[in-house]
Amino acid sequence: HNTTVFQGVAGQSLQVSCPYDSMKHWGRRKAWCRQLGEKGPCQRVVSTHNLWLLSFLRRWNGSTAITDDTLGGTLTITLRNLQPHDAGLYQCQSLHGSEADTLRKVLVEVLADPLDHRDAGDLWFPGESESFEDAHVEHSISRSLLEGEIPFPPTS
């Protein structure tokens, strides 16, 4: 799976969309999980309604919400009041039994609120530094990493 980068502004909401084949994943609940390292396990953050027919209902876990357009084939995750610690690698998953298929790998980046000068040194302002090697980042929108592209080096 390629990784898609979503950039949001600290203190604001970030919407992550995960398109999928609605027929292939018909009847399957979906989930949003946080990956603990590129090769690590993915910890469930929130999942869609227990009744698949009610997947359109928004479910919250803390500041994270999930809703599923099962006909259109789009899973949407909302991260409210985005904070630096929300940065990281996530997955959109399609659940079947105890198994989970990855719909999309997502890298969430947190950018500074340009209107908030209190923590100006604490967050990355777009254009201040390049976060990727050999890659152009279009700020505040998503993009896919190229095949085999590594966004950052592995680290703890």
Epitope: R34, Q35, L36, G37, E38, K39, G40, P84, H85, A87, G88, L89, L107, E109, V110, L123, W124, E128, S129, S131, E133, G148, P151, F152, P153, P154, T155, S156
Partner: antibody, heavy 120, light 107 residues
């Protein structure tokens, strides 16, 4: 028991090469990134590079590019670091280090270190 | 390369003291910072990952904070086994780089 066991101390002459091994037990190296970090006597830590044993991809610090080769043999769960054209300033303890990569790895294992002495 | 600058380079403290070590990155590194503890003749041990997350088995007297370019490691009440050298390490970009280390000695 999860551990990384490194090969023994080496004494080499300037210009020679050294190959240090790092054998994993209790886990599969394909599930980890293997890094090499060195520490000269009385000095700090210096990252040399890493390998993804599953893919065979490796990445090196510019300082060591062209002199270091990191490889892995998944059949024996062993990683290797070879440093060529040795000079006296390469005298250091070399550590292998396994983790799950970027974005909050909760796994972190280190070898016991291998002292490489370069002396004429 | 991203330069990591730790301060102080060494400090003397007593058991029970509150100790603070800072690490400054020359570029923005978001929260991709780890703190390691190393004792003489031993391999480093991970204390904190992702700037503020305590690694498994690490005592709660250790804490990390910060994001962007400035980070802090705090030991709330220094214990005898905490006398060691501490390193920060960034994981924002290649190559990984460490701070020069902070040696915590007995006063």
């Amino acid at each position: 028991q999860v551990q990384l066991v490194q090969s023994g101390a080496e004494v080499k002459k300037p210009g020679a090469s050294v190959k240090v091994s790092c054998k994993a037990s209790g886990f599969s190296i394909e599930d980890f990134y293997i890094h090499w970090v060195r520490q000269a006597p009385g000095q700090g830590l210096e990252w040399m590079g890493w390998i993804d044993p599953e893919q065979g991809d490796s990445k090196y610090a510019p300082k060591f590019q062209g002199r270091v080769t990191i490889t892995a043999d998944t059949s024996t769960s062993t990683a290797y670091m070879e440093l060529s054209s040795l000079r006296s300033e390469d005298t250091a303890v070399y550590y292998c280090h396994a983790d799950h990569g970027n974005y909050g790895s909760t796994m972190d294992y280190w070898g016991q270190g291998t002292l490489v002495t370069v002396s004429s | 390369d991203i330069q990591m600058t730790q301060s102080p380079s060494s400090l003397s403290a007593s058991v029970g003291d509150r100790v603070t070590i800072t690490c400054h990155a020359s570029q923005h590194i978001n929260v991709w910072l780890s703190w390691y503890q190393q004792k003489p003749g031993k391999a480093p041990k991970l204390l904190i990952y992702k700037a503020s997350n305590l690694h498994t088995g690490v005592p709660s007297r250790f804490s990390g904070s910060g994001s962007g370019t400035d980070f802090t490691l705090t030991i709330s009440s220094l214990q005898p086994e905490d006398f060691a050298t501490y390193y920060c390490q960034q994981g924002q970009t290649y190559p990984r780089t460490f701070g020069q280390g902070t040696k915590v000695e007995i006063k």
